[in-house]
Amino acid sequence: HPSPAPPDQLNTSSAESELWEPGERLPVRLTNGSSSCSGTVEVRLEASWEPACGALWDSRAAEAVCRALGCGGAEAASQLAPPTPELPPPPAAGNTSVAANATLAGAPALLCSGAEWRLCEVVEHACRSDGRRARVTCAENRALRLVDGGGACAGRVEMLEHGEWGSVCDDTWDLEDAHVVCRQLGCGWAVQALPGLHFTPGRGPIHRDQVNCSGAEAYLWDCPGLPGQHYCGHKEDAGAVCSEHQSWRLTGGADRCEGQVEVHFRGVWNTVCDSEWYPSEAKVLCQSLGCGTAVERPKGLPHSLSGRMYYSCNGEELTLSNCSWRFNNSNLCSQSLAARVLCSASRSLHNLSTPEVPASVQTVTIESSVTVKIENKESRELMLL
């Protein structure tokens, strides 16, 4: 099948609430519950999560939240008593206004005109913030994830069913199937649908075989298919790489640990804008590539690729995608050069024939932008044909 056409996209970042990424459903989560599919409803407002107002919580919103989280329908929607005493009654006529403080500290509500997440809206300051909180218990504890691909948007496909994480067999696995996975996870669209052994094999049960999505399904478990049963082994675990997955390489240097910083994102390689490229960003990149630590940030050259990516790290992140990042889709880096870095494991520093790479878990970026982890002491080069 041809790859689904990427949707037109606006500028995006790692901490955005107004513009939802392709495939992202609702900026909601459930906390303090018995599973990821029950608990107090919280909505994302800019950089923080706030409890959703219980006074305006209804069955439509509960149904939409459960569906958006891949948890089936809603089994029970309720309100949690507030942590503080109940609200006072409306003020008697003639009393001084008490709105000043309560108004500004209003709680957000999730308002839905139907039971589908597309019909929902987060409305800020919709309720008195010391009122009841929305709670929901969803019917199914189902979930989906991508594992061992160097980020949440690439890796081996795993489904949670009956309390157990398991794989999906790669028989008939194609871009339409991967597209459903990517969209469900808020990871954009599918760049690659990968057969077994591109990522480390799974260990649990194999939940699905002969998956045959049209590409329009909201959840992977809505796609036609067979139970995993006995016909597949973990050498046939399906994988996916989504457009929102980021992988990195250094080019134009003495080896893979030195050069111009390039990120594969949304199907193309991009240079990184050096206007926000500091030691903390360089350190995270060198470490994530298994190249030691950053030694210097050589002066950049003009962008040889479209330069649209900015990163801001504190230096403790595992990869650059864990940092705050910004992808400017409409403008190239203004008045900046392409970021470069020299890592401590580069042979241009050590005059070694091969760079020193940590032996435990090595992150390898391979052609076509798939990032995998190889858990042995030998360095192996993987190529996708």
């Epitope: 609200l87 409306p90 003639g94 206004s97 709105a99 309560a102 409305v123 919709a126």
Partner: nanobody, 123 residues
Framework: QVQLVESGGGLVQPGGSLRLSCSAS????????LGWFRQAPGKEREFVAA????????YYADSVKGRFTISRDNSKNTLYLQMNSLRAEDTAVYYC????????????????WGKGTLVTVSS
């Protein structure tokens, strides 16, 4: 007791505009979230639009989004509903509502109702 009095209803042609007002007797007007509901002949009462205490947050029914605008003037104790591109299906009695605890999107949170003003859209 908050008294809500609607005005501005009337007969208008399809595609036309009307502005409804709702004045409140209550001096603590700004303590209430406000909204509009409507009831067409033979139909159930339905939510139209709501606005929070300070007017910073609004919410609309899908059927009126992009055509109706809710606003409030706390200094005048008045709520407004600007209705543009009116359609025959907008014909209804429009009720002003006030709520203390939450924006009046669902009927169970509403503390006070006005008596209503009739809007008729017909050629």
């Amino acid at each position: 007791q908050v008294q809500l009095v609607e005005s501005g209803g009337g007969l208008v042609q399809p595609g036309g505009s009307l502005r409804l007002s709702c004045s409140a007797s209550e001096r603590t007007f700004s303590d209430y979230a406000l909204g509009w509901f409507r009831q067409a002949p033979g139909k159930e009462r339905e939510f139209v639009a709501a606005i929070n205490w300070v007017g910073g947050s609004t919410y609309y029914a899908d059927s009126v989004k992009g055509r109706f605008t809710i606003s409030r003037d706390n200094s005048k104790n008045t709520l407004y509903l600007q209705m543009n591109s009116l359609r025959a299906e907008d014909t209804a009695v429009y009720y002003c509502v006030a709520s203390w605890g939450a924006m009046p999107v669902l009927t169970h949170v509403i503390n006070y109702w006005g008596k209503g003003t009739l809007v008729t859209v017909s050629s």
